[in-house]
């Protein structure tokens, strides 16, 4: 038995930050689970981990140097990624593992979300600024 995951097909990170919501066909309330976000077609880079254990405080960490945070809903985990670089534009996959109660469950591979990171475009200052107001 596999958990199904739904993700937005594409998101644009305008300010080098993005919220990616992973929606599951499973209620995470009162479960011990490990939700993770993976980068690349082969999911080679684990971007962020959200660990939940019953009523305890959610734990969020990245083993790969990403700046991430996470929020938990009954059937979703939202990853908030900050300080993304343009070259981190890629496809990102949500993964969920439920360790307790048994049996161990994980998800069918989702379609993923393409995150397109748009760099900060600073407006050039005008060549001839008008008179400044007092």
């Amino acid at each position: 038995n596999k958990i199904l995951v739904k993700q937005s097909p594409m998101l644009v990170a305008y300010d080098n930050a993005v919220n990616l919501s992973c929606k599951y066909s499973y209620n995470l309330f009162s479960r011990e689970f490990r939700a993770s976000l993976h980068k690349g077609l082969d999911s080679a880079v684990e971007v962020c981990v959200v660990y939940g254990n019953y009523s305890q405080q959610l734990q969020v960490y990245s083993k790969t140097g990403f700046n991430c945070d996470g929020k938990l809903g009954n059937e979703s985990v939202t990853f908030y990624l900050q300080n993304l670089y343009v070259n981190q534009t890629d496809i990102y996959f949500c993964k969920i593992e439920v360790m307790y109660p048994p049996p161990y469950l994980d998800n069918e591979k989702s379609n993923g979300t393409i995150i397109h990171v748009k760099g900060k475009h600073l407006c050039p200052s005008p060549l001839f600024p008008g008179p400044s107001k007092p």
Epitope: R34, E46, V49, Y51, Q56, Q57, Q59, V60, Y61, K63, T64, G65, E97, V98, M99, Y100, P102, Y104, D106
Partner: antibody, heavy 115, light 107 residues
């Protein structure tokens, strides 16, 4: 209640390969990461690396070139190999459940490297 | 890698008194910090994770606080079984790193 039992050779000569096994009893093996940590005599703790049931691994860069961690899900066991050991690798080696915090721990094995 | 510094190296406290142990990170680790207790000849035991969440079975006299770079483990009333070495460990950046430990001894 998860318990970890570890075993392996306690006395090695320089350049040999350290080999330890940790068995997990009384709890789920899948979904968790399983770690190795060491502690030289009278000193602090050093994280070596970890593995999950799928064989995904993470290593301390200071040891990565010499470390192999593998898993046998049929036996709920994971193992550590450390090649080309020197006296600086003399330590108590612990296995533990977890990837970010560790609970519980194995009993530890004192590994001495001496010619 | 992140360097974890614990102080003091040794803390002398009388039974029943409060003990306050400090841990400082060389850069922010948010709230991703653990505390462990280790007695001679034994493996470490997890006390606190997430800077303030007590692990299963840990008495309420142990409490953790702090975030960013400054953290504190407080033992509100020291019992005889609490005399041990205490380590902090961060998990905000890999590799995971531990502090050098604080030995809590009987005054």
């Amino acid at each position: 209640q998860v318990q970890l039992q570890q075993w392996g050779a306690g006395l090695l000569k320089p350049s040999e390969t350290l080999s330890l096994i940790c068995a997990v009893y009384g709890g789920s093996f899948s979904g968790y990461y399983w770690s190795w940590i060491r502690q030289p005599p009278g000193k602090g703790l050093e994280w070596i690396g970890d593995i999950n049931h799928s064989g995904n691994t993470n290593f301390n860069p200071s040891l990565k070139s010499r470390v192999t961690i593998s898993v046998d899900t049929s036996k709920n066991q994971f193992s550590l190999k450390l090649s080309s050991v020197t006296a600086a690798d003399t330590a108590v080696y612990y296995c533990a459940k977890g990837e970010a915090w560790f609970d519980p721990w194995g009993q530890g094995i004192m590994v001495t490297v001496s010619s | 890698e992140i360097v974890m510094t614990q102080s003091p190296a040794t803390l002398s406290v009388s039974p029943g008194e409060r003990a306050t142990l400090s841990c400082r990170a060389s850069q922010s680790v948010r709230s991703n910090l653990d505390w462990y207790q280790q007695k001679p000849g034994q493996a470490p035991r997890l006390l606190i994770y997430g800077a303030s969440t007590r692990a299963t079975g840990i008495p309420a006299r142990f409490s953790g606080s702090g975030s960013g770079t400054e953290f504190t483990l407080t033992i509100s009333s020291l019992q005889s079984e609490d005399f041990a070495v205490y380590y902090c460990q961060q998990y905000n950046n890999w590799p995971l790193t531990f502090g050098g430990g604080t030995k809590v001894e009987i005054k």
